[in-house]
Each structure stands twice: as C-alpha cells, then as structure tokens.
C-alpha cells in the first residue's frame, strides 16, 4: 500500500466507578482515532488493539475485530473503549481519586494503539503512543485534544 496514516486524536470520555471495599478504580476510557487511506483503492482494517498504562503498569487492554473498510483517499474516525482497573499495588491512587477537597483528579496515562490492515495475506501494523490526562474523580467528556499531556517523553508529530 502507498500509505495508511493512523493518528491518535485523544480521549473522548472517561467514565469512573469505584469499589470501596477493594479500594479499586474502574475507568472506561473511550478514545478517538483517525485512520486515513492514501491509496487509490479501498483498504480493510482488520483489527485495533489498544492498551493503557499507568506508572509503567498495564491497567487495561481492548481489541476490536473486523472494524471497517476505508475508501481511497478517505478517512474514518473510529472510537474505541478500553476498560481499565487501578487496583492492588496501585490502590493508593484510590485516596487521590476520591479526595473531595480537590476539583480535578488528573492522572497521566499512556495510551498505546495498534491498527492492523491486511494486504493479500500480509499484515501491516501501525502503532501510536500518547500520554493523556484523565480525571479519575468524575465522569468526564473531553473536547478532542483537550486531554493531551505534553512532556519530553512524548514525541510531537
């Protein structure tokens, strides 16, 4: 293929719930991805795999199969949700996320996503990594790009 461009746009929404007994945080994070087909023919997106890391620990994974086909010189915006769990050795975060005295409980998460297209039996994978702020203290809907976390670890595109 000429090229298939994948751009991670950002977090669209984060829905939070807690287990008080287990001091566990459940975050359902919906992300937005733009996939652009620069070829002069349609391509099929076979799957999208995603994972979320907090403090270098994987806290959630998701996989979407048989997503879509994208026409030539066209772009599709795809939303995907990763269920995440912050628990056990990270249960100290429960206190921070449920602290009433602060308004915004932002934590930095690393979003990793891999898009797989198949071309006559040959798979092509394109990956992206982005650091994002997510509020673990309340349900939040974000403007696209609003949750981006910029630091030296995150190469700019």
């Amino acid at each position: 293929p000429r090229s298939i461009d994948v751009k991670y746009i950002g977090v669209k929404s984060a829905y939070v719930s807690y287990d008080v007994q287990k001091r566990t945080i459940y975050l359902n994070i919906t992300n937005t991805l733009n996939i652009t087909n620069n070829n002069y023919y349609s391509v099929e997106v076979e799957n999208i795999t995603a994972q979320v890391q907090f403090a270098k620990t994987v806290i959630g994974k998701a996989r979407l199969n048989n997503i879509t086909h994208i026409g030539p010189l066209d772009m599709k915006q795809i939303d995907y949700t990763v269920p995440t769990v912050i628990a056990e050795e990270m249960s100290y975060m429960y206190d921070f996320c449920t602290l009433i005295s602060i308004k915004v409980h932002n934590i930095v998460l690393m979003m990793q996503v891999t898009v797989t297209t198949t071309y006559f039996g040959h798979s092509e994978q394109i990956s992206q990594e982005r650091y994002q702020y997510v509020d673990c203290g309340r349900n939040t809907t974000y403007q696209l790009g609003q949750s981006e976390y910029l630091n030296v670890l995150q190469p700019q595109q």
Partner: antibody, heavy 122, light 107 residues
Framework: QVQLQQSGAELIRPGTSVKVSCKAS????????IEWVKQRPGQGLEWIGV????????NYNEKFKGKAKLTADKSSSTAYMQLSSLTSEDSAVYFC???????????????WGQGTSVTVSS | DIQMTQSPSSLSASLGERVSLTCRAS??????LNWLQQEPDGTIKRLIY???SLDSGVPKRFSGSRSGSDYSLTISSLESEDFVDYYC?????????FGGGTKLEIK
C-alpha cells in the same frame, strides 16, 4: 452508458485562472475516482492528480501542487479542476478520467472525457 | 517517479500485419499497466488493463503481455482504424506515469 462531459475550449490571459468542469453520467459518481491528465500540443500525457468525489480527498503530482486544485460537487455529479497563475506552459488539452477500484485493487482510467483545450495567450 | 520508456516512437506497417509496441518500466510495477489508444480527434480509450486484460468492446486482435520489466501491446492483424497513437500507463505508484507514445502509421 458512462459519459464524462467536459466544458468547452478556453482562451485565457496569462496570470489569470480557469476552471474546467467534468460532468459525469451513467454511473454512481461517488463510487469512482476522477483523475486529471494534461496533454500539451503534439506531446505525451502527464498525470495531474486524483480526487475521490465521495470524500473530497485528493492527491496531486508534485509538479502540479499549487497549480491545480481539484474539487467535486456530489449534487451535480461534476468534478472541477482549477488552474491558477496561467502561463503559456499551461496551454494544453486537459482530460478528466474515471477510475474504478475495489478492496486492494485498482483499475484506473477506464473512461475518458473528450478533453478541454486551454490556450493561454495575451 | 517511475519512468516508462515506450518504443518505437513511430512505426510504419501494412494492413493485416502483426505489430508489437513495448514499454519498459524503470522500477518494478507488477501487472499495474494499461494500454491506451488515442484517435486523431483526441479521443482516448483504454484497451488493456492489468497488463493483459482486454476491456469490453475491444477487438480480440489486441493483446497485452509482460516479460520482466518489458510490457507489450500486440495487434495480431492491423486494420485501418488501428493507425492511431498508443500510450502505456503505469499505476503501481504515484505519480502515475505514461510512456512517450507510439504513432502507428500506414505503410
């Protein structure tokens, strides 16, 4: 039957611009690509660029970036090519061409318009 | 850009004769090649796509083939309407590029 009907011949002053139209009929306009090709008098063919009328997505030959702008109007099944800052080098016949495609396959340039002659002269 | 070198640039032949036109690709283009015919009034039509597939309505005397990086258009028995211009087109990569053309003239 498939037809690509192009606008008539143009005589244009240097430095101005021209918009050539290509009206498609006999098929679903947004299911195919439209490409544009240049042919200077007595010379060969040169690819300008391509547009997907469904998405509006375009790709250009580097040589024609800034010179040609491709657009399409789905409601009238018409593709357009605007040429700007015209010089004598732009005097040519311009063809619009339909291209078909599938998943991972392309069968380009199956139907051609009749061509539009653009003459740049003061 | 991929260069398509077409030969000969002109060819004189007689009615009923068998002729072959050739295009050589500067890079691998697989089977991504068309042959086009241009009439004196400027009308262009595709004769062959994907190296060897004949377009509907095109007479069977036209055929396409490939040997390595050389692509051929063969006309098995020339008829009067075949004495026009022919071009090859590669569509393996962008920008699409054309051969310089062959003018087929009656001897």
């Amino acid at each position: 039957q498939v037809q690509l009907q192009q606008s008539g011949a143009e005589l244009i002053r240097p430095g101005t611009s021209v918009k050539v139209s290509c009206k498609a009929s006999g098929y679903a306009f947004t299911d195919y690509l439209i490409e544009w090709v240049k042919q200077r008098p007595g010379q060969g063919l040169e690819w300008i660029g391509v547009i997907n009328p469904g998405s509006g997505g375009t790709n250009y030959n580097e040589k024609f970036k800034g010179k040609a702008k491709l657009t399409a109007d789905k409601s009238s099944s018409t593709a357009y090519m605007q040429l700007s800052s015209l010089t004598s080098e732009d005097s040519a016949v311009y063809f619009c061409v339909r291209s078909s495609y599938g998943v991972y396959v392309a069968y380009p340039m199956d139907y051609w318009g009749q061509g539009t002659s653009v003459t740049v002269s003061s | 850009d991929i260069q398509m070198t077409q030969s000969p640039s002109s060819l004189s032949a007689s009615l009923g004769e068998r002729v072959s036109l050739t295009c050589r690709a500067s890079q691998d283009i697989g089977s991504n090649l068309n042959w086009l015919q241009q009439e004196p009034d400027g009308t262009i039509k595709r004769l062959i796509y994907a190296t060897s597939s004949l377009d509907s309505g095109v007479p069977k005397r036209f055929s396409g083939s490939r040997s390595g990086s050389d692509y051929s258009l063969t006309i098995s028995s020339l008829e009067s309407e075949d004495f026009v211009d022919y071009y090859c087109l590669q569509y393996a990569s962008s920008p699409r590029t054309f051969g310089g053309g062959t003018k087929l003239e009656i001897k």
